[in-house]
Amino acid sequence: NSLATENRFVNSCTQARKKCEANPACKAAYQHLGSCTSSLSRPLPLEESAMSADCLEAAEQLRNSSLIDCRCHRRMKHQATCLDIYWTVHPARSLGDYELDVSPYEDTVTSKPWKMNLSKLNMLKPDSDLCLKFAMLCTLHDKCDRLRKAYGEACSGIRCQRHLCLAQLRSFFEKAAESHAQGLLLCPCAPEDAGCGERRRNTIAPSCALPSVTPNCLDLRSFCRADPLCRSRLMDFQTHCHPMDILGTCATEQSRCLRAYLGLIGTAMTPNFISKVNTTVALSCTCRGSGNLQDECEQLERSFSQNPCLVEAIAAKMRFHRQLFSQDWAD
């Protein structure tokens, strides 16, 4: 499950920039746009961030280049560079236009067949909970075990360094096989099994990964938007986990929504299970003190805690994980 290289993707932003740099007009327009978006490091109020005419002109010049449709991949090398390029060529999205739009990540889904040797689990007691079983499957897999230990170490201790913990969490969810990562986090527990639920809730080391002082959700989002990676992951989540109807239909596919959800873990917008007795997830933030933005704040909160697409996607994956162990694996 090696890291993907840029070349594997139809139109990665790093490749598109190389092409652009070979064309003097494209290169000049791109460089000019770079200066237009450099103010991103300090988010501005919308009215102050209106783009100047020359910045809009530079953006227009790139309309016909391959940069305009470029994308990045969650598992690519130099992902940060790729995302920087993406946000440079999409200045309107960078400068306050946060309507749900196109995810910066490419839209192809390559669902790999389930690859796990479940027979190794016979060393566990047959009645062990499934979160324990999935944790064991990770332990028995060298790469998963190594990555999990890395974030375990970074996220442990009384005085853990949160930024290092988050970086290692991101590394785990980017580099571990998807089946291991999803199995570990989205393991099903019996409703009465609080121990299992607690294990699941502690998967992402919330005592270190989540903020010690609960921030306002809108402040959290603003903080996220100031960082290209977090902004990208949030837009990916908004794109793929948008519910189309009350049945819980996702705007794209459940698998893409789950991938986007897992992509938020290790960012400022890290979600988690809120209790050991159910599968409700939420951001670690509050809408208290939102003033006249209370509705907007609650909508952000609900996009995690009461999102029928996400709820359905998590439930379906947990059903799948339960079925894996209900089959007879002796053969």
């Epitope: 948008h242 189309m244 109807d245 009350i246 049945l247 239909t249 596919e253 459940q254």
Partner: antibody, heavy 115, light 108 residues
Framework: QVQLVESGGGLVQPGGSLRLSCAAS????????MHWVRQAPGKGLEWVSV????????YYADSVKGRFTISRDNSKNTLYLQMNSLRAEDTAVYYC????????WGQGTLVTVSS | DIVLTQSPATLSLSPGERATLSCRAS???????LAWYQQKPGQAPRLLIY???NRATGVPARFSGSGSGTDFTLTISSLEPEDFATYYC?????????FGQGTKVEIK
């Protein structure tokens, strides 16, 4: 390529039955909620029915409830609409649709209920 | 049932003009579940906007949606010749899902 193809339409007498099929190709059919929508000649769109990914949940418009049954066979990538006790007002072009961000609609199949 | 009422029934405009179409619900609709479609004669509908304000895949930027609660709007900033068609709103917030009766945008 990604497409939906309806079949099974035709002329039927009032009180009769018809079964519409919608064959899906080019995408993972079982990953999507599916709808039937109809349009009477010269009229607007009317939502008919919806079925969840696995077929466990189905819902209907009041005008067809108790007479129409939506179902799916994910192994065959096919959506169905069983229409019983047909009435003249059921005459329409019937579309099957995948209503998501990248939507897909079939070309429609005409059902005519007339004596 | 949630009844959606679209207005006007017909809109006569010239290419390049701005079109504003209204969709009013008989009761509050969660904006996540409000969609707009375009349909041309002899063709199947095409999703334009979902979640009240989000453009579907491949939809040009001149189409935008807005609104919440019971009042929703589809705006076409500058009409192109290919935009003359019938537009429908749909709610998927309560069963049965329902469509509005449509607004026909015709060439003046």
């Amino acid at each position: 390529q990604v497409q939906l193809v309806e079949s099974g339409g035709g002329l039927v007498q009032p009180g009769g039955s018809l079964r519409l099929s919608c064959a899906a190709s080019g995408f993972t059919f079982s990953n999507y909620t599916m709808h039937w929508v109809r349009q009477a000649p010269g009229k607007g769109l009317e939502w008919v029915s919806v079925i969840s990914y696995d077929g466990s949940s189905t819902y209907y418009a009041d005008s067809v409830k108790g007479r129409f049954t939506i179902s799916r066979d994910n192994s065959k990538n096919t959506l169905y609409l069983q229409m019983n006790s047909l009435r003249a007002e059921d005459t329409a072009v019937y579309y099957c649709a995948r209503i998501v961000r990248m939507d897909i609609w079939g070309q429609g199949t005409l059902v005519t209920v007339s004596s | 049932d949630i009844v959606l009422t679209q207005s006007p029934a017909t809109l006569s405009l010239s290419p390049g003009e701005r079109a504003t179409l209204s969709c009013r619900a008989s009761q509050s609709v969660n904006s996540h579940y409000l969609a707009w479609y375009q349909q041309k004669p002899g063709q199947a509908p095409r999703l334009l906007i979902y979640g009240a304000s989000n453009r579907a895949t491949g939809v040009p930027a001149r189409f935008s949606g807005s609104g919440s609660g019971t009042d929703f709007t589809l705006t076409i900033s500058s009409l192109e010749p290919e935009d003359f068609a019938t537009y429908y709103c749909q709610q998927m917030d309560g069963f049965p899902f329902t469509f509005g009766q449509g607004t026909k945008v015709e060439i003046k």
